[in-house]
């Protein structure tokens, strides 16, 4: 085995020293005789040491001893000691005490034999064992004066060989992570929590991360244990985008033929039932009423026109009831109602005319007289030398309860090619031309159109007291919605509790699964903000879909096109949610179609207005938008534009 030069020297030095020991002792006796007992010259000293270096070292110092203690002849004991010590260059010991194993006296010199871990001429320099191959340590080498030792990083312990390290399994201690999951790692360990939770080292437990504090959501953020959900202003036409954090516009995904006809007059614009057109005719010359127009509707009931004076005088009202024309008239305070002719709410154009003759009124449909009524008097009434007639279209100038027979005045119908009193009517034409809301859709089908900008609501009761149950109330909510959506997000049906400003129930279209944070087209059934059931739907296929919802004590079902939806809650959660719903139903609730009022976006999974065609049946009764307590004026109650044909 070969040793490095320095170590080899250290190994050999003591042996060498022992070999010279005999000669050293002889030399000492010779020095005593020549230079201690006697005064010696340089040459005599040379004879003692038999070499120049030792002589050159000794002699100047010898003279120093003489100077200090006097000549040998004074017999000063200090002189003898002074001289005897001069040739031994290890006395006094020049080597470092800590690092020297032995001092070797050499010819005019000395050699410090170092202990292991020390070096330098005087063995006063610490050898850094760590500088070469890390001192043989696997991880950490600690150098120290004259020595070194190995240690390990945190999470490791030193093996019995004092050099290698082995991992400590901290997870063996059941208290390492407290409630959290412990995962051992090389030299460490990690306390793991489920997504949405973070480990608290103080509490040794998983704590919910409030992601909302991190500003992840563009609009409204709701934190939940282990998660969060972002909400967008649905009523403002926004929905969650693909990243589930930012918002984007709700855009139509099915184009509807919403083009309007500038030469048409829409009669259903005023939900209040007030007329869409008010005309007053005045003549010096006595004149008779002549009115003719083309008309189209699917609506079974409503007012086409009124002609006459104030409500207590003489007037006629042409209306629709059960799809047939009805004429209500009052002449000199005496009222009558006549109904006749074919069903005309078939959605096709037909020409209707009203003509006042000398002693009767004639109503015609497509030039065929369907009513001829004898009357005593004129509709134009004289006043201060002029004959007056008020004519209103799509409503009456007084309350419907003051009619001969009350009627719902609202009429979702369309008029064109009108002619009043054989006159050229530029006024209405000019007004309609610049006001698109007064115009009709060019083409319509049956249904109700929700334009994505408003809702309708009703005051309906969902509690019932069956005779066989006595006074105990039961409840049910059964909704059938026939929908042809134009957009992928919107409220179809909802209940609103005005007192609590809560949404006890909602059925809506949504394009993501909120808990799975997954984009998917769904129908959601929810009580307040909790989804009870979800069902996939092909919302943008331009086809009609049937959404059925049934809720009663103990059960809640959602079906789309006959396929039952997936429950999102446990049986216990369902019971709790249904109990919440029932509590709401015992207080006043309003039934909303096509949207919600201005509620917080977190009140329900969806707050956006529905866009598309829809008819709603609630508890086996078809909802008529003309009968609503309120309807947005852009919702058409009995007509819907068709889906635009695909471009060739």
């Amino acid at each position: 085995a070969l040793l490095p030069a320095r170590e080899a020297t250290q190994f050999l030095r003591p042996r060498q020293r022992r070999a010279f020991q005999v000669f050293e002792e002889a030399k000492q006796g010779h020095l005593e005789r020549e230079c201690v007992e006697e005064l010696c010259s340089r040459e005599e000293a040379r004879e003692v040491f038999e070499n120049d270096p030792e002589t050159d070292y000794f002699y100047p110092r010898y003279l120093d001893c003489i100077n200090k203690y006097g000549s040998p002849y004074t017999k000063n004991s200090g002189f003898a000691t002074c001289v005897q010590n001069l040739p031994d260059q290890c006395t006094p010991n020049p080597c470092d005490r800590k690092g020297t194993q032995a001092c070797q006296d050499l010819m005019g010199n000395f050699f410090c034999l170092c202990k292991a871990g020390w070096g330098g001429r005087l063995c006063d320099k610490d050898v850094n064992e760590c500088s070469q191959e890390n001192g043989g340590c696997l991880q950490i080498c600690h150098n120290k004066p004259g020595s070194f030792h190995c240690s390990c990083h945190s999470g490791f312990e030193l093996s019995s060989d004092g050099r290698t390290c082995q991992d400590i399994d901290e997870c063996a201690d059941s208290e390492a992570c407290g409630e959290a999951r412990c995962k051992n790692l090389p030299g460490s360990y990690s306390c793991l929590c489920d997504e949405g939770f973070a480990y608290s080292s103080q509490e040794k437990a998983c704590r919910d991360v409030d992601e909302c504090l991190q500003g992840r959501c563009e609009q409204v953020c709701v934190n939940s244990p282990g998660s969060y959900t972002c909400h967008c202003d649905g009523r403002g036409g926004l929905k969650l985008s693909q990243d589930m954090d930012t918002c984007e516009d709700i855009l139509p995904c099915v184009p509807f033929s919403v083009a309007k006809s500038v030469k048409s007059l829409y009669l259903g614009r005023m939900f209040s039932g007030t007329p869409v057109i008010r005309l007053r005719f005045k003549r010096l010359q006595p004149t008779r009423l002549v009115a003719e127009f083309d008309f189209r509707t699917f609506d079974p009931e409503g007012i086409l026109l009124f002609a006459g004076g104030h409500q207590d005088s003489t007037w006629i009202v042409l209306a629709l009831r059960a799809g047939r024309l009805e004429l209500q008239l009052r002449y000199n305070g005496v009222g009558r109602v006549t109904s006749s002719g074919p069903v005309i709410n078939h959605g096709m154009w037909q020409t209707i005319s009203v003509e006042e003759l000398a002693r009767n009124l004639v109503i015609k449909v497509n030039r065929d007289a369907v009513m001829k009524i004898a009357v005593a008097g004129d509709l134009f009434q004289p006043e201060r030398g002029l004959y007056h007639l008020n004519l209103t279209v799509g409503g009456i100038p007084f309350h419907e309860k003051d009619l001969v027979q009350p009627i719902n005045p609202r009429l979702d119908g369309c008029m064109r090619s009108w002619n009043w009193l054989n006159g050229e009517d530029t006024t209405i034409q000019e007004t309609v031309k610049v006001n698109t809301r007064m115009q009709c859709f060019s083409v319509t089908e049956r249904g109700s159109f929700y334009p994505g900008s408003g809702f309708a609501f009703y005051s309906l009761d969902y509690m019932r007291t069956p005779l066989d149950v006595g006074t105990e109330s039961t409840w049910e909510v059964e909704v059938v919605a026939h929908i042809r959506p134009a957009a992928d997000t919107g409220v179809l049906f909802a209940l609103w509790a005005p007192d609590l400003r809560a949404v006890p129930l909602s059925v809506a279209l949504v394009d993501y699964h909120s808990t799975k944070k997954l984009k998917k087209q769904l129908v959601v059934l929810a009580v307040e903000h909790t989804a009870l059931a979800l069902m996939e739907i092909k919302v943008c296929d331009g086809q009609e879909h049937v959404v059925t919802v049934s809720l009663r004590d103990g059960e809640a079902t959602l079906e789309v096109d006959g396929t039952r939806g997936q429950s999102e809650v446990s049986a216990a959660q369902l019971q709790e949610r249904l109990a919440v719903l029932e509590r709401h139903l015992r207080s006043p609730v309003l039934t909303f179609a096509g949207g919600l009022p201005d509620v917080p976006v977190t009140s329900a999974p969806v707050t956006a207005f529905y866009r598309g065609c829809m008819t709603l049946e609630v508890n086996r009764r078809l909802l008529d938008l003309d009968e609503a307590a309120y309807k947005h004026s852009d919702i058409t109650a009995h007509s819907c534009p068709p889906v635009e044909p695909a471009a060739a």
Epitope: K282, R283, Q285, G385
Partner: antibody, heavy 116, light 107 residues
Framework: QIHLVQSGPELKKPGASVKISCKAS????????MNWVKQAPGQGLKWMGW????????TYTEEFKGRFVFSLDTSVTTAYLQISTLKAEDTATYFC?????????WGQGTLITVSS | ETTVTQSPSSLSVSVGDRVTITCITS??????MNWYQQKPGKAPKLLIS???TLRPGVPSRFSSSGSGTDFTFTISSTQPEDFADYYC?????????FGQGTKLEIK
């Protein structure tokens, strides 16, 4: 298109008579009465009265009773204004206007100048 | 007979100015007031009919208000083509009566 076209200007001597015409087109003549309005030079408008185109019955305001006559020829859908025993103060532009309680459609006016 | 008093009889304004003309009736005529514009050598043109109704094709700078006996006609910002004579006409009762007229001149 509704039009009322009046006859041309007339220069007459005091004491003479004049008959001006107003030809109606573009609507049913007998459905609307015909009005007559006078405007003296630099003066305002004055309603003279009207004629029922169904019955031919005229109605005159107090100021225009006597020398003024409204008449019709329904076959040619024309209304006439005749002024007899003309006076200097009859110098004016006379307009016909269709009755609809107010006046929307007017003739272009006929200037009658009475001067000796 | 309902008399109509129109004021002022003449008015001198600059282009862009706001103009107001007033008519007062001797009886309550509800809102049966009409307003006409007449240019030299032409027939009057109906601008606003009963019920303060702006006639088709008439610019929106013309407006009127009033009911009962006090009526106001306004041009919000006078244009060069607006310099003409203006008349009010009540059509509540026979005889129909005009106001004396207002001459709108350029300043």
């Amino acid at each position: 298109q509704i039009h009322l076209v009046q006859s041309g200007p007339e220069l007459k001597k005091p004491g003479a008579s004049v008959k001006i015409s107003c030809k109606a087109s573009g609507y049913t003549f007998t459905n609307y009465g015909m009005n007559w309005v006078k405007q003296a030079p630099g003066q305002g408008l004055k309603w003279m009265g009207w004629i029922n185109t169904n019955t031919g019955e005229p109605t005159y305001t107090e100021e225009f009773k006597g020398r003024f006559v409204f008449s019709l020829d329904t076959s040619v859908t024309t209304a006439y204004l005749q002024i007899s025993t003309l006076k200097a103060e009859d110098t004016a532009t006379y307009f016909c206007a269709r009755d609809e309680g107010w006046f929307v459609y007017w003739g272009q006016g006929t200037l009658i100048t009475v001067s000796s | 007979e309902t008399t109509v008093t129109q004021s002022p009889s003449s008015l001198s304004v600059s282009v862009g100015d706001r103009v107001t003309i007033t008519c007062i009736t001797s009886t309550d005529i509800d809102d049966d007031m009409n307003w006409y514009q007449q240019k030299p050598g032409k027939a009057p043109k109906l601008l606003i009919s009963e019920g303060n109704t702006l006639r088709p094709g008439v610019p929106s700078r013309f407006s009127s208000s009033g009911s009962g006996t006090d009526f106001t006609f306004t041009i919000s910002s006078t244009q060069p083509e607006d310099f003409a004579d203006y008349y009010c006409l009540q059509t509540d009762s026979v005889p129909l009566t005009f106001g004396q007229g207002t001459k709108l001149e350029i300043k």
